[in-house]
C-alpha cells in the first residue's frame, strides 16, 4: 500500500523558519503534490505550494522555497515573519496525486519535545485520506 511521510523541522538558525519534507512511498508516477497548513487541503487547510513534476511549482507566502528533492519527495521552506508565520504546533499536510494509485495525504507537525534544528525522523505518517 502506498504511504506518504511528512517531516517538519524548525531551523536552528532561524527559530521561526520551518522546513517541511514530504515523500511518497509507492510505485506510481506522481502527477501533483499539494502542501497545506492548518489541516488537509480542502478541509480547512490553506495551500502553501503546488508542485507538478514537469510543469513547474507554484507557492504562496509564507512559503519561501518549494522544490523537488527526488522524483518522489519534496521540500518546502517557510519564512517565519509576520502574521502568517507558522508556530510550533502548526499542522502541515502533503497530498500526493499518483497514477494509478489515486490521491494520498498525510499530515505532521513539529515533535513536541524537539529542539531547534532537530526533527523527527521521516517515518510514514498516518494516512488521512486516500481518494
Amino acid at each position: 500500500t502506498p504511504e506518504v511521510w511528512v517531516q517538519v523541522r524548525m531551523e536552528a538558525t532561524e527559530l521561526s523558519s520551518f522546513t517541511i519534507r514530504c515523500g511518497f512511498l509507492g510505485s506510481g508516477s506522481i502527477s501533483l503534490v499539494t502542501v497545506s497548513w492548518g489541516g488537509p487541503n480542502g478541509a480547512g487547510g490553506t495551500t502553501l505550494a503546488v508542485l507538478h513534476p514537469e510543469r513547474g511549482i507554484r507557492q504562496w507566502a509564507p512559503a519561501r522555497q518549494a522544490r523537488w528533492e527526488t522524483q518522489s519527495s519534496i521540500s518546502l521552506i517557510l519564512e517565519g515573519s509576520g502574521a502568517s508565520s507558522p508556530c510550533a504546533n502548526t499542522t502541515f499536510c502533503c497530498k500526493f496525486a499518483s497514477f494509478p494509485e489515486g490521491s494520498w495525504e498525510a499530515c505532521g507537525s513539529l515533535p513536541p519535545s524537539s529542539d531547534p534544528g532537530l526533527s523527527a525522523p521521516p517515518t510514514p505518517a498516518p494516512i488521512l485520506r486516500a481518494d
Epitope: G42, T46, W68, E69
Partner: antibody
Framework: QVQLQQSGAELVKPGASVKISCKAT????????IEWVKQRPGHGLAWIGE????????NYNEKFKGKATFTADTSSNTAYMQLSSLTSEDSAVYYC???????WGQGTLVTVSA | DIVMTQSPSSLSVSAGEKVTMSCKSS????????????LAWYQQKPGQPPKLLIY???TRESGVPDRFTGSGSGTDFTLTISSVQAEDLAVYYC????????TFAAGTKLELK
C-alpha cells in the same frame, strides 16, 4: 472541458481604473492559480501575477505591483483583475490562464484613450 | 529575473520543411532534485491566446501533433517541427517555468516562404 471566459473589451480614460473578469468552468477553481498575462504589440508576453482562489493568496510581478490587484469569488468561480491609474502604456490585451498556462481565456482588450 | 532569448526572431519556410528554433535562458531551468527542466513552448496565432505545446522541455501537451518536439536541458533548448504545415504559421514563445516570475522570450515568427 476546462474553459476560461473573459469579460469584453474596455475603452477607458487615462487615470481611470478597470476591472476585468475571468470565469472558470470545468475544473476545481479553488485548487489552481489564475494567472494574468499582458500582451502589447511588439512587447511580447508579460506575467502580471497570480491568485489562488481557494485562499486568495497572491503573487505579483514586481513590475506590476501597485498597478494590478487580484481578487477571486469562489461562489461564482470568477477571478478579477483591477488595473488602476491607467495610462497609454496599459493599453493591451490581458489574458487569464490556469494550470501552468495550459488553459487560456480569449483575452480582454483594454484601450486607454482620452 | 530569468531572461529568455529566442533565435531567430523570424523564419521563412516552405510546407513540408523541417524547422528548428532555439531558446536560451540566463539561468539553468533544470531542477536537480527530479532532473526535470522547467521550460514550456507556446504557439500563438493572430487574434488568439497562446496555446501550450510543450512543457517540461520535452513533454507534448495533450492533443499536440507529434511533429512538434522539444529538447534541451539547463540553459539551451530547441523546438523542432519535423514537417511544417500551413496551420503551423504562427509566433512561437518559450517560457521559464522554473522560478518566479515566469518570463517569456520575445518569440520566433514562422512565416511562409
Amino acid at each position: 472541458q476546462v474553459q476560461l471566459q473573459q469579460s469584453g473589451a474596455e475603452l477607458v480614460k487615462p487615470g481611470a481604473s478597470v476591472k476585468i473578469s475571468c470565469k472558470a468552468t470545468g475544473y476545481t477553481f479553488s485548487s489552481f492559480s489564475i494567472e494574468w498575462v499582458k500582451q502589447r504589440p511588439g512587447h511580447g508576453l508579460a506575467w502580471i501575477g497570480e491568485i489562488l482562489p481557494g485562499s486568495n493568496s497572491t503573487n505579483y510581478n514586481e513590475k506590476f505591483k501597485g498597478k494590478a490587484t487580484f481578487t477571486a469569488d469562489t461562489s461564482s468561480n470568477t477571478a478579477y483583475m483591477q488595473l488602476s491609474s491607467l495610462t497609454s502604456e496599459d493599453s493591451a490585451v490581458y489574458y487569464c490562464s490556469s494550470y501552468w498556462f495550459a488553459y487560456w481565456g480569449q483575452g480582454t482588450l483594454v484601450t486607454v484613450s482620452a | 529575473d530569468i531572461v529568455m532569448t529566442q533565435s531567430p526572431s523570424s523564419l521563412s519556410v516552405s510546407a513540408g520543411e523541417k524547422v528548428t528554433m532555439s531558446c536560451k535562458s540566463s539561468q539553468s531551468l533544470l531542477n536537480s532534485g527530479n532532473q526535470k527542466n522547467y521550460l514550456a513552448w507556446y504557439q500563438q496565432k493572430p487574434g488568439q491566446p497562446p496555446k501550450l505545446l510543450i512543457y517540461g522541455a520535452s513533454t507534448r501537451e495533450s492533443g499536440v501533433p507529434d511533429r512538434f518536439t522539444g529538447s534541451g536541458s539547463g540553459t539551451d533548448f530547441t523546438l523542432t517541427i519535423s514537417s511544417v504545415q500551413a496551420e503551423d504559421l504562427a509566433v512561437y514563445y518559450c517560457q521559464n517555468a522554473h522560478s518566479y516570475p515566469p518570463t517569456f522570450a520575445a518569440g520566433t515568427k514562422l512565416e511562409l516562404k
